[in-house]
């Protein structure tokens, strides 16, 4: 049961995370005009990955897309790329994880296949989350650099008679959405990888043979306790005798090759 819960929760957390990454990528408020220590302007500037906007105090908002590829800063292009890669990997991960979900039966899919798919989707979520976090962090770093540069200009460029309002930009809402979403996707991916361990069946390809000895009724499994290396199929020295029915999760809770990823 714990495995199903972990897998399901991992899927849901990743789903929320990827939705957040998509939302952050589409949002216009990656950087917003810094209003602290600034003259009170009747316009508010903010910028996204795809367009820049100006909201006038009258309520009118006007946005202009960046209709150039070559004219954009390399860093902005890199952030765009990271976010898109994160979305694509996340979307594929979601697709794979849907089929890997334990609660969904698709034909006669083996548990080992589901385990592999769970692991694959988990890794995809982890990379997706890292891409988003990296993209947002690169943009944030770019903002901090530009902020201090424009602050320096603010105090050095006052020599002339005419003053210019220097627009400085600070962190926008999209950055926080991106960081949180990336973190959620990462956590979801880790949960999927953890769930994968519990999903994997034993490596033995043959059924257990029962020997009925007089006096005691025990099931003997050849290779049940492997010798000393500790990397066998039953490293936890599980008691073979159950004395009753097992839940679906318990049936598949033996360690496997996926334990030591």
């Amino acid at each position: 049961m714990a495995v199903t819960a972990c897998q399901g929760l991992g899927f849901v957390v990743s789903l929320i995370g990827i939705a957040g990454i998509i939302a952050a990528t589409c949002m216009d408020q990656w950087s917003t005009q810094d209003l602290y220590n600034n003259p009170v302007t009747a316009v508010f500037n903010y910028q996204g990955l795809w367009r820049s906007c100006v909201r006038e105090s009258s309520g009118f908002t006007e946005c202009r897309g960046y209709f150039t590829l070559l004219g954009l800063p390399a860093m902005l292009q890199a952030v765009r790329a990271l976010m898109i890669v994160g979305i694509v990997l996340g979307a594929i991960g979601l697709l794979v994880s849907i089929f890997a979900l334990k609660c969904i039966r698709i034909g006669s899919m083996e548990d080992s296949a589901k385990a592999n798919m769970t692991l694959t989707s988990g890794i995809m979520f982890i990379v997706s989350g890292l891409c988003a976090i990296a993209g947002v962090s690169v943009f944030a770093n770019m903002l901090v650099t530009n902020f201090w540069m424009s602050t320096a200009n603010m105090y050095t460029g006052m020599g002339g008679m005419v003053q210019t309002v220097q627009t400085r930009y600070t962190f926008g809402a999209a950055l926080f959405v991106g960081w949180v979403a990336g973190g959620l996707t990462l956590i979801g991916g880790v949960m999927m990888c953890i769930a994968c361990r519990g999903l994997a069946p034993e490596e033995t390809n043959y059924k257990a043979v029962s020997y009925h000895a007089s006096g005691h009724s025990v099931a003997y499994k050849p290779g049940g306790f492997k010798a000393s290396t500790g990397f066998g199929s039953n490293t936890k020295n599980k008691k073979i005798y159950d004395g009753g029915a097992r839940t679906e999760d318990e049936v598949q809770s033996y360690p496997s090759k996926h334990d030591y990823v």
Partner: antibody, heavy 117, light 113 residues
Framework: QVQLKESGPGLVAPSQSLSITCTVS????????VSWVRQPPGKGLEWLGV???????NYQSALRSRLSIRKDTSKSQVFLKLNSVHTDGTATYYC???????????WGQGISVIVSS | DIVMTQSPSSLTVTAGEKVTMSCKSS????????????LTWYQQRPGQPPKLLIY???SRESGVPVRFTGSGSGTDFTLTISSVQAEDLAVYYC?????????FGGGTKLEMN
Amino acid sequence: QVQLKESGPGLVAPSQSLSITCTVSGFSLINYGVSWVRQPPGKGLEWLGVIRGDGNTNYQSALRSRLSIRKDTSKSQVFLKLNSVHTDGTATYYCAKVGRGNAMDHWGQGISVIVSS
Amino acid sequence: DIVMTQSPSSLTVTAGEKVTMSCKSSQSLLNSGNQKNYLTWYQQRPGQPPKLLIYRASSRESGVPVRFTGSGSGTDFTLTISSVQAEDLAVYYCQNDYIYPYTFGGGTKLEMN
């Protein structure tokens, strides 16, 4: 169509409060701001303040301590209150709708206010 | 506060003549976000409320005749009337619409010969 109309007393005694109401039609005060401007006889225009669609206000520096602008969205009314007026408060007071570019695109006819004892 | 200076204070013209009037601001009215200048021109005929002519320095308000043109950027702005008509006799005001508190220029009075 867009209309604005100022109303209030035409005569105010010095050191009293001047209150003017601007009743609007043809647009919503939720979406648009309203500015107040005054013009002393034979002189130029003087911007007093603005109340934006979101309810935030900005005032002229010299009058900030004595001026307040508020609105009643449901009644489509904007109120200007200027405390302890002096004789230099004698002017025609206009309210105007704020449009694109923060410009005042529609104006009321104005109300003439005389500050005198 | 931003100081708006208009020149000349009055202007005497003849019908059909081209007229230009100037407006200077003590601070730049250019917004870097959209590269627009937040300067507005108003026309006030005698006994009437002001009327919006030009917003964002060069955008003509709907219904305003094409003979009115606004230009300039940063701190220096110009209103041009390509061919003055009798109905253009009025006082013209420029206004800072960028930094609070908004401020008007002293006005340019257009008179006929």
